[in-house]
Interface confidence: low
């Protein structure tokens, strides 16, 4: 019965079981809903839209890393589809903490201006070097906790309030 | 079979306010979105703005803000639309519509038949 | 906000007859593009998502192409039934916006 299926499983009324709910493929995430005994008759899977990817089966598109705007880093390989984007290096005026533990934030580059004395990716930075790069100016920004704060909260890629 | 049943028609005062509704049937009220589009004669829709039924969160067409209102009530699975301070260019037919996915708020998958306001002295 | 460009407003054809209704956005909206089809008793349905993704149920006479800004709905052997007012919508940026519709009659 419907309340035996899983989180990813539909009550197929033809044979009485349980079924998986078709998986989506990398780069699309589930269009309606599909699991715990009941699949939408138009379940499908869509592409994910510009700026996010997902590896497929069940999970939501996600949005790439915002390496310049959030790690103050510069972007090593743009996401697609499929794939997050990677952060390289700090961005110029900026420098990584090598000793912090990383959290969910991974490894962030902190501002020269907070740096400890001879820090060697700040040696002959200015004082202005963090004044106006991308992602700084305005409240725009989200981190990537945020971000998925927001997808939970059912705003999606639209949202700009 | 999913079914948005709208409240009846409104005959209301400038001035007034107004508050309609839409009852969900036939999926989970909480797994989407609910949309709210204005269409005045004879014209095209409009995005008022929409609700996550779990979280209670909303987007506003910021046209919008300030004049609706979105709130549900989970336990009967009705969304709401208040309307304030109306005046006639609030004369319309207000649609609700159920989204897809909560992650895609601009899709419109079932409407509701559409209720009639008119603002009129 | 993006603007929606519907035309031609409205359209006469004979049945049978393939119809084709254009919609151009005010800047790149990715094929984030869907069609709802509106009856004359104000039945509002989602006909194509995602520019040429079918919705459930919708006949196959119905098709949907378009990149960047211009997009098209296409109708290829019309039917009675087939009469109503056609909106493009756009969804890659809030707040969505509608085209100014397309109503189709039979000659």
């Known amino acids: 019965e419907y309340s035996n299926c899983g989180e990813n499983e539909y009550y197929n009324q033809t044979t009485g079981l349980c079924q998986e709910c078709p998986p989506c493929g990398p780069g699309e995430e589930p269009y309606l809903s599909c699991g715990y005994g009941t699949k939408d008759e138009d379940y499908g899977c869509v592409p994910c839209p510009a700026e996010k990817f997902s590896k497929g089966g069940y999970q939501i598109c996600r949005r790439h890393k915002d390496c310049e705007g959030f790690f103050r880093a510069t972007v090593l390989t743009p996401g697609d589809m499929e794939n997050d984007a990677e952060c390289g290096p700090c961005l110029p005026g900026y420098y990584m903490l090598e000793n912090r533990p990383r959290n969910i934030y991974g490894m962030v580059c902190y501002s020269c201006l907070l740096a400890p004395p001879n820090t060697k990716e700040c040696v002959g930075a200015t004082s202005g070097a963090s004044a106006n790069f991308p992602g700084t100016s305005g409240s725009s920004t989200l981190s990537p906790f945020q971000h998925a704060h927001k997808e939970l909260s059912g705003q999606g890629h639209l949202a700009t309030a | 079979e999913v079914q948005l049943e709208k409240s009846g028609a409104e005959l209301v005062k400038p001035g007034a306010s107004v508050k309609i509704s839409c009852k969900a049937s036939g999926y989970s009220f909480t797994g989407y979105n609910m949309n709210w589009m204005k269409q005045s004669h004879g014209k095209s829709l409009e995005w008022i703005g929409n609700?996550?039924?779990?979280?209670?969160?909303?987007n506003y067409n910021q046209k919008f803000k300030g004049k609706a209102t979105l709130t549900v009530d989970k336990s009967s699975s009705t969304a709401y639309m208040q309307l304030n301070s109306l005046t006639s260019e609030d004369s319309a037919v207000y649609y609700c519509a159920r989204g897809g996915v909560r992650e895609l708020p601009g899709w419109f998958t079932y409407w509701g038949q559409g209720t009639l306001v008119t603002v009129s002295a | 906000d993006i603007v929606m460009t519907q035309s031609p407003p409205s359209l006469s054809a004979s049945l049978g007859d393939r119809v084709t209704i254009s919609c151009s956005a005010s800047q790149g909206i990715s094929n984030y593009l869907n069609w709802y089809q509106q009856k004359a008793d104000g039945t509002v349905e989602l006909l194509i998502y995602s520019t040429s993704s079918l919705h459930s149920g919708v006949p196959s006479r119905f098709s949907g192409s378009g990149s960047g800004t211009d997009y098209s709905l296409t109708i290829s052997n019309l039917e009675p039934e087939d009469i109503a007012t056609y909106y493009c919508q756009q969804y890659s940026k809030l707040p969505p916006t509608f085209g100014g519709g397309t109503k189709l009659e039979i000659k």
């Open positions: 609700i996550n039924p779990y979280y209670g969160s909303t």
